[in-house]
């Protein structure tokens, strides 16, 4: 017989020879990192037809790392379903807990023993320190010193000393989230007041107000014979300016050689070049002005 078969988990005892006589026996042992569990044979004989009798390494089992329990408030998940060396054990924590230590352990071979690459991690409760205090405002639960996962606080602004109220800029409610950090930055309380929006040859058609505070929204239309250059809708933003800027109403050119004017500013505009009679602020007698504006 020629050289005996080789296996993943089993190796020949002694040196292999190039040829073996009929009836000659060779013995195998489990390789390093594997251990033998009877009854399967670990030897073979050179048969008279010059082939080796059947043998397998199925009696050799990988060394196994010790079983690790789920961490308290978490879970250990075997990546490939067994504890044999080469296995990966992934750790995750339940919602509201965070991992202290390595999130993956590897089953490794040290000499002939399979051991885990480190200590199992712990799952600790997510806690947040109190959220930031803000000028001209306050948050709920200001007396609490430690917040648990998903505990929420709500910010509100103080009454303003002057005629204009403080506006809350940002998220009014924030919660204790992953990484023991708050879900959003603390908001800001400040007076936000936009100027009265004046449009020559046009007028405001919605969003009327005594004063225009944060997020106030105003819409305009132009007089007959004028078209809107800019957006018909503007919003009072946190820096006390209108965004987009207050539009202008420009005179519609009646000269046939001139191109119909189109808006150069960002914001709603016709998606086609309407005839002069279809400009915003230049409606047909039987329809409202806003029918000719994009929403």
């Amino acid at each position: 017989c020629e050289a005996p078969p080789t296996f993943e988990a089993m190796e020949l005892i002694g040196k292999p020879k190039p040829y073996y006589r009929v009836g000659e026996r060779v013995d195998y042992k489990c390789k390093k990192g594997y251990f033998y569990i009877p009854p399967l044979a670990t030897h073979t004989i050179c048969d008279r037809n010059h082939t080796w009798l059947p043998v397998s390494d199925e009696g050799c089992y990988r060394e196994m790392c010790p079983h690790i329990r789920d961490p308290l408030n978490g879970e250990a998940i075997l990546a490939n379903g067994s504890y044999e060396f080469g296995a990966e054990l992934h750790f995750i924590c339940n919602e509201g807990y965070y991992l202290i230590g390595k999130d993956i352990l590897y089953c490794e071979l040290k000499d002939t023993v399979a051991i885990w690459s480190g200590k199992p991690p712990l799952c600790e409760k997510i806690l947040c320190t109190p959220p930031p205090k803000i000028k001209n405002g306050k948050h709920t639960f200001s007396e609490v010193e430690v917040f648990e996962y998903l505990d929420a606080v709500t910010y509100s602004c103080d009454p303003a000393p002057g005629p204009d109220p403080f506006s809350l800029i940002g998220e009014s409610m924030i919660y204790c989230g992953n990484n023991s950090t708050w879900s959003h930055a603390a908001p800001e309380c400040k007076v936000v007041k936009c100027r009265f929006p004046v449009v020559e040859n046009g007028k405001q058609i919605s969003g009327f107000g005594k004063k225009f505070y944060y997020k106030a929204t105003v819409m305009f239309e132009c007089d007959k014979g004028y078209y809107l250059n800019g957006s018909d809708k503007i919003v009072c933003e946190s820096n006390s300016t209108w965004d987009p800027p207050v539009p202008k109403c420009l005179k519609v050119s009646t000269s046939p050689t001139t191109k119909s004017p189109t808006s150069s500013a960002s914001g709603p505009r016709p998606t086609y070049k309407p005839p002069v009679s279809n400009y915003p602020g230049y409606p047909k007698p039987d329809e409202g002005i806003l029918n000719n504006l994009d929403d």
């Epitope: 100027r195 009265f196 007028k203 009327f208 005594k210």
Partner: antibody, heavy 118, light 107 residues
Framework: EVQLVESGGGLVQPGGSLRLSCAAS????????ISWIRQSPSRGLEWLGV???????NYNSAFMSRFTISRDDSKNTAYLQMNSLKTEDTAVYYC????????????WGQGTLVTVSS | AIQLTQSPSSLSASVGDRVTITCRAS??????LNWYLQKPGQSPQLLIY???SLHEGVPDRFSGSGSGTDFTLKISRVEAEDVGVYYC?????????FGQGTKVEIK
């Protein structure tokens, strides 16, 4: 609190020109929106125009061709330039601080009288 | 331009009377209406802005109401110091315009 004082009024012949001044004390004229308003027995109160803090202007179209509003920040003064004056322009002229960017007039000066007569 | 028409053009009241002045706009102006009082020999002074908001320092016997085209200024109990000419002013649209005035006298 800023005080606005009008000056430059007087007698002028029809067709003539006059420049009214509005001097600010206790504050910067460029920090406020300044409107000009006039009052006469025959025509009542008439808003003429405004110069905004950013230097932009809006006018009453009835006077746009003859009246111009400007500002000189170095002199801390706003101006109303009136050309081609007519007898019906005879009135007391007020410069007025627009209330905090809103078109209501809470800060009236004493005004300056302009008489257009030959 | 938007026209504002005040009525009556003049009225005479006794101290303590309730006085009502109306202002009608030639087109809808939402609540963008102010009221002024010009006392004899003085410049006008702001009484009410945005239809019903009292300007600082104005006594609460003054009140304003209305919306759209019809507006009212009321003095609940008129006093001697309330004499003068009352003006309304709109600011929804340029040019900002004033009413012709209502003269209030005390009997």
């Amino acid at each position: 609190e800023v005080q606005l004082v009008e000056s430059g009024g007087g007698l002028v012949q029809p067709g003539g020109s006059l420049r009214l001044s509005c001097a600010a004390s206790g504050g910067s004229v460029s920090s406020y929106d300044i409107s000009w308003i006039r009052q006469s027995p025959s025509r009542g109160l008439e808003w003429l125009g405004v110069i905004w803090t950013d230097g932009g202007t809006n006018y009453n179209s009835a006077f746009m061709s003859r009246f111009t509003i400007s500002r000189d920040d170095s002199k801390n003064t706003a101006y109303l330039q009136m050309n081609s004056l007519k007898t019906e322009d005879t009135a007391v002229y007020y410069c007025e601080r627009v209330y905090d960017g809103y078109p209501w007039f809470a800060y009236w000066g004493q005004g300056t009288l302009v008489t257009v007569s030959s | 331009a938007i026209q504002l028409t005040q009525s009556p053009s003049s009225l005479s009241a006794s101290v303590g009377d309730r006085v009502t002045i109306t202002c009608r706009a030639s087109q809808g102006i939402s609540n963008y209406l102010n009221w002024y009082l010009q006392k004899p020999g003085q410049s006008p002074q702001l009484l009410i802005y945005y239809t019903s908001s009292l300007h600082e320092g104005v006594p609460d016997r003054f009140s304003g109401s209305g919306s759209g085209t019809d507006f009212t200024l009321k003095i609940s109990r008129v006093e001697a110091e309330d004499v003068g000419v009352y003006y309304c002013q709109q600011y929804i649209k340029l040019p900002w315009t004033f009413g012709q005035g209502t003269k209030v006298e005390i009997k």
